[in-house]
């Protein structure tokens, strides 16, 4: 009996067309929600003029349907049993579960500036960028729409610079109309232990963000990962979001919707500094922001965003070190609202459930000839939005599964 | 040993422009921006503008916007400064000059407008 | 604009003496300024850079002082090389802009 339903497993996992897993994975079943909070400064004059610390207070939710486009450009490839397929981005606002509108108002940091900043050092540039500033009329926080900070605004400031750069800024600019990958994964046809793991991310086997093995492309996009899943195992896998691979540890067993499922967490540790975590060292990039690699729950990944200074942690800095926080006011981190889960049917070792939480952060530096960043006195690590994604799989599916796979087993 | 050295002397007609080179040694250019300056017989210096070879930033003194174009080649390591539409009070000694506190100067290009 | 009002126009000194001479900022500029020595015939050459730092090379008895908006430069114990002018440059904002210059004549 076992054997029987280990071989049907093996090959309804397997993606190809006319499988149970394929259907499912060129295009999700489940509704796939992307909820924000964005960080409203409350003193900006404040910060700017006294280097106080940022008071902020989260507005949201905001909630966008996602993931509802099918993969692009499938491609099987029989010579190495992989498949190779674009993931589309596409976002709908839900104004029926927000808060308000996407016109809203909010105070953030101004984006352009801290960005401009950080990727010009040099001294001489820092006052021609501060010309344009004080031309335009920018600031050190600014007033944007939750459209214009989400999807893109022309920059004044950046409007002015008298050479060729981009002057739209926006935290997932360009989204609508791009497409993520190409991404290569193991369809599992001659070995189903590698189904959905990905062999190439752009045609790479790393990333070229990182040194060593934190530059690896491990495990699979977490939508699923190879069948027989162990509460023993650490399940590897990749992130384009946070350009890196990471990991997730079982954590209890759930009950959803009447199947039986292994719910897997990010650890704390997998945020660590390399002084608690060694395996760490290599996403410590540098060593003034990082206080010498002890600060710890941020993820500087200014080199997988063209230099700019973006750095992305848990949301509310949950698992950060004060440090990092101590600027902020405002924050209250608890673990079952911002960490991150999966809940994994073992068997089939697709994910059924999950919530990824994360925040989006910007390092803004005092600036000697930037006159709007020249009363800094210290650094900040400014928390501009933090997401929940989450899925939950349907009902009809849910008994579909109960009766087709749990049900059988039990 | 960092060393700025400039083309030589020129007499030029009112109208006519000039372009003047500065070739830079002893460091890496791109690494620091180039600044001119400019000391007309007899009186004090005035900045010009200045460029940075690694990012293309050039900032125009008011006064010569539109007449002054500060260009750099960071294949020769060579600054350059061609000044347009030359009337007889552009006549002076024209000094490239290295960052943002003038630490290293080229020797001076002499420019005389005349007709 | 930062405009940069220097004084006295002209000074005369005896070797031993001590001579100072004044930059008056028409914006806080903060201690970006920077002091300079120029020969006839001769470029300009840096003394000291911002934050009053002496440049490696240059006596001792050149030092400088000021913050915000008021600046002095100091020569102390004259001796007759220093025969010179001298200019003050602020260096916080664009335009950079110079002093008129202190022509330093020793008797």
């Known amino acids: 009996g076992d054997l029987l339903i280990q071989k049907t497993i093996k090959k309804q996992v397997v993606l190809e067309e006319g499988t149970i897993a394929f259907k499912n994975w060129v295009k999700t079943g489940t509704e796939v929600y992307r909820q924000f909070w964005i960080f409203d400064v409350q003193n900006p004059q404040e910060v700017m003029m006294n280097s106080s610390n940022i008071q902020v207070k989260q507005r949201g939710p905001y909630t966008y349907r996602v993931r509802f486009l099918a993969k692009e450009n499938v491609t099987q490839d029989a010579e190495d049993n992989t498949v190779s397929f674009l993931q589309p981005n596409g976002a709908i606002f839900e104004p029926s579960l927000s808060v308000g509108t996407e016109a809203d108002n909010f105070t953030v940091l101004n984006l352009a500036v801290a960005a401009a900043s950080h990727i010009y050092q040099n001294q001489f540039v820092q006052m021609i960028l501060n010309s344009l500033i004080n031309k335009s009329k920018s600031s050190m926080f600014q007033v944007r729409t939750l459209r214009e900070l989400l999807w893109g605004y022309r920059d004044p400031f950046l409007s002015l610079v008298p050479y060729p750069v981009t002057t739209t800024v926006g935290l997932f600019y360009p989204y609508n109309n791009t497409a993520d990958g190409v991404y290569k994964v193991f369809n599992g046809k001659d070995n189903i232990s590698k189904v959905a793991i990905i062999d190439t991310y752009k045609g790479k086997r790393n990333l070229s963000y990182w040194e060593s093995h934190c530059d690896m492309i491990n495990g699979t996009d977490a939508a699923s990962f190879p069948p027989f899943v162990e509460k023993s195992q650490v399940l590897q896998f990749f992130s384009s979001d946070i350009c890196r691979s990471i990991y997730a540890v079982f954590e209890s067993d759930v009950n959803l919707k009447g199947i039986p499922v292994y719910r897997f967490v990010l650890p704390s540790k997998a945020f660590a500094s390399p002084v608690e975590n060694p395996d760490n060292y290599c996403f410590c990039t540098e060593k003034i922001i990082s206080k010498n690699c002890t600060s710890y729950g941020v993820l500087d990944i200014s080199k997988c965003k063209e230099g700019r200074p973006v750095y992305i942690s848990l949301p509310h800095f949950l698992y950060a070190s004060p440090d990092v926080s101590e600027p902020i006011d405002g924050l209250n981190p608890n673990e079952e609202e911002h960490r991150t889960y999966l809940d994994i049917e073992p068997i089939t070792g697709f994910t059924l459930q999950f919530a990824k939480r994360l925040q989006v952060n910007l390092l803004v530096k005092p600036s000697e000839k930037i006159q709007v960043l020249k009363n800094l006195k210290r650094n900040y690590i400014v928390p501009i939005l933090w997401l929940n994604e989450t899925g939950t799989i349907g009902d009809e599916k849910a008994n579909m599964f109960r009766s087709q796979v749990t049900g059988k087993i039990n | 040993e960092v060393q700025l050295v400039q083309s030589g002397a020129e007499v030029k007609k009112p109208g006519s422009s000039v372009k003047v080179s500065c070739k830079a040694s002893g460091y890496r250019f791109s690494d620091y921006e180039m600044q001119w300056v400019r000391q007309a017989p007899g009186q004090g210096l005035e900045w010009m503008g200045g460029?940075?070879?690694?990012?293309?930033?050039?900032a125009y003194a008011q006064k010569f916007q539109g007449r002054v174009t500060l260009t750099a080649d960071k294949s020769t390591s060579t600054a350059y400064m061609e000044l347009s539409s030359l009337r007889s009070e552009d006549t002076a000694v024209y000094y490239c000059t290295r960052k943002l506190d003038f630490d290293y100067w080229g020797q001076g290009t002499l420019v005389t407008v005349s007709s | 604009e930062t405009t940069v009002t220097q004084s006295p126009a002209f000074m005369s000194a005896t070797t031993g003496d001590k001579v100072t001479i004044s930059c008056i900022t028409s914006t806080d500029i903060d201690d970006d300024m920077n002091w300079y020595q120029q020969k006839p015939g001769e470029p300009p050459k840096l003394l000291i850079s911002e934050g009053s730092t002496l440049r490696p090379g240059v006596p001792s008895r050149f030092s400088s002082s000021g913050y915000g908006t008021d600046f002095t430069f100091t020569i102390n114990n004259i001796e007759s090389e220093d025969a010179a002018y001298y200019y003050c440059l602020q260096s916080d904002n664009l335009p950079l802009t110079f002093g008129q210059g202190t022509k330093l004549e020793i008797k």
């Open positions: 460029i940075d070879p690694e990012t293309g930033g050039i």
